[in-house]
């Protein structure tokens, strides 16, 4: 059976991560006319720099806060069958991409962001890394 190259696998994981983040943002945007203000009280921290896979450590650091936001939305009305499982899947993908031995010390922006700003920024980061890989 043909085996995919490490680079191809990495790209597939990045595309899966991008898809998951887009699903979350879409869910929250659908929530906008409903209970979004409750979710906007949460602070998220964005990386000063995120251009490489090791920088995904900064995303992993924030997954706990993301989980709490999803808990608040009561996943039924958010159209996520299993919010906890969803975050677990993102965490597994992130670890695959950055490596479990990664000891990268994340540097965050001083200004915190809302969950919407946070997801938009990480979607852009994933898209940027993917486009760099495919060049």
């Amino acid at each position: 059976a043909p085996t995919s190259s490490p680079a191809k696998e990495t790209q597939q994981h990045l595309e899966q991560l991008l898809l998951d983040l887009q699903v979350l943002l879409r869910g929250i945007d659908n929530y906008k006319n409903l209970k979004l203000p409750m979710m906007l009280t949460f602070k998220f921290y964005l990386p000063k720099q995120a251009t490489e896979l090791k920088h995904l450590q900064c995303l992993e650091n924030e997954l706990g806060a993301l989980q709490r936001v999803l808990d608040l939305t009561q996943s039924k009305s958010f159209h996520l069958e299993d919010a906890g499982n969803f975050i677990s899947n993102i965490r597994v993908t992130v670890v695959k991409l950055k490596g479990s031995e990664n000891k990268f010390e994340c540097q965050f922006d001083d200004e915190p962001a809302t969950v919407v700003e946070f997801l938009r920024r990480w979607i852009a980061i994933c898209q940027s890394i993917i486009s760099t890989m495919t060049q």
Epitope: P37, M38, L40, T41, K43, A65, P112, T114
Partner: antibody
Framework: EVQLVQSGAEVKKPGESLKISCKGS????????IGWVRQMPGRGLEWMGT????????RYSPSFQGQVTTSADKSISTAYLQWGSLRASDTAMYYC??????????WGQGTMVTVSS | SYELTQPPSVSVSPGQTARITCSGD??????AYWYQQKPGQAPVLVIY???ERPSGIPERFSGSSSGTTVTLTISGVQAEDEADYYC???????????FGGGTQLTVLG
Amino acid sequence: EVQLVQSGAEVKKPGESLKISCKGSGYNFDTYWIGWVRQMPGRGLEWMGTIYPADSDTRYSPSFQGQVTTSADKSISTAYLQWGSLRASDTAMYYCARFSSSAYDIWGQGTMVTVSS
Amino acid sequence: SYELTQPPSVSVSPGQTARITCSGDALPRQFAYWYQQKPGQAPVLVIYKDTERPSGIPERFSGSSSGTTVTLTISGVQAEDEADYYCQSADSSGTYHVFGGGTQLTVLG
């Protein structure tokens, strides 16, 4: 103009029931949480709870859970706060406030409730 | 239940800078909001999301955040700024909102 107008002052006896109101205008009342805040004489603000008029989802402060009930009638853009049996310690000013983009940006003028035998 | 801690009172002379602090364990993860309340009036939002100022609020009002403490700063205090100031935030789950105990700002002279 966006505003919340609350019902007038009330004087009640201990053990009586009461329902006060908060009517929104100038915005889509359905899609903003309405919070209720108590201020006892000479004291600070206390968050009691919030209600989302579109589906009547409610959140109560643990301190007020079971003591009061919030409700809403979206057809007339009005939120309510009610007591089944008032006590003297319920004497306070009660404010409703709109929760928007994560802050209480618009406040009602307040309803003074006095409970005395 | 979750609490926000403020000093009961702060006194400053006109033209000076007043700083009112608010501490709470969840503040690194929850935005804070500041309200001004004058006697006999409903509260008014003066700072939201730690540092943002609503339209119509004078530039002398500003907010900052560091760890578990947020600070409301009023530069060049004026007599009309004499009021009670309340911080407000949510618990770590985002479910419950809470107000600090309030700080009475006195403008001397």
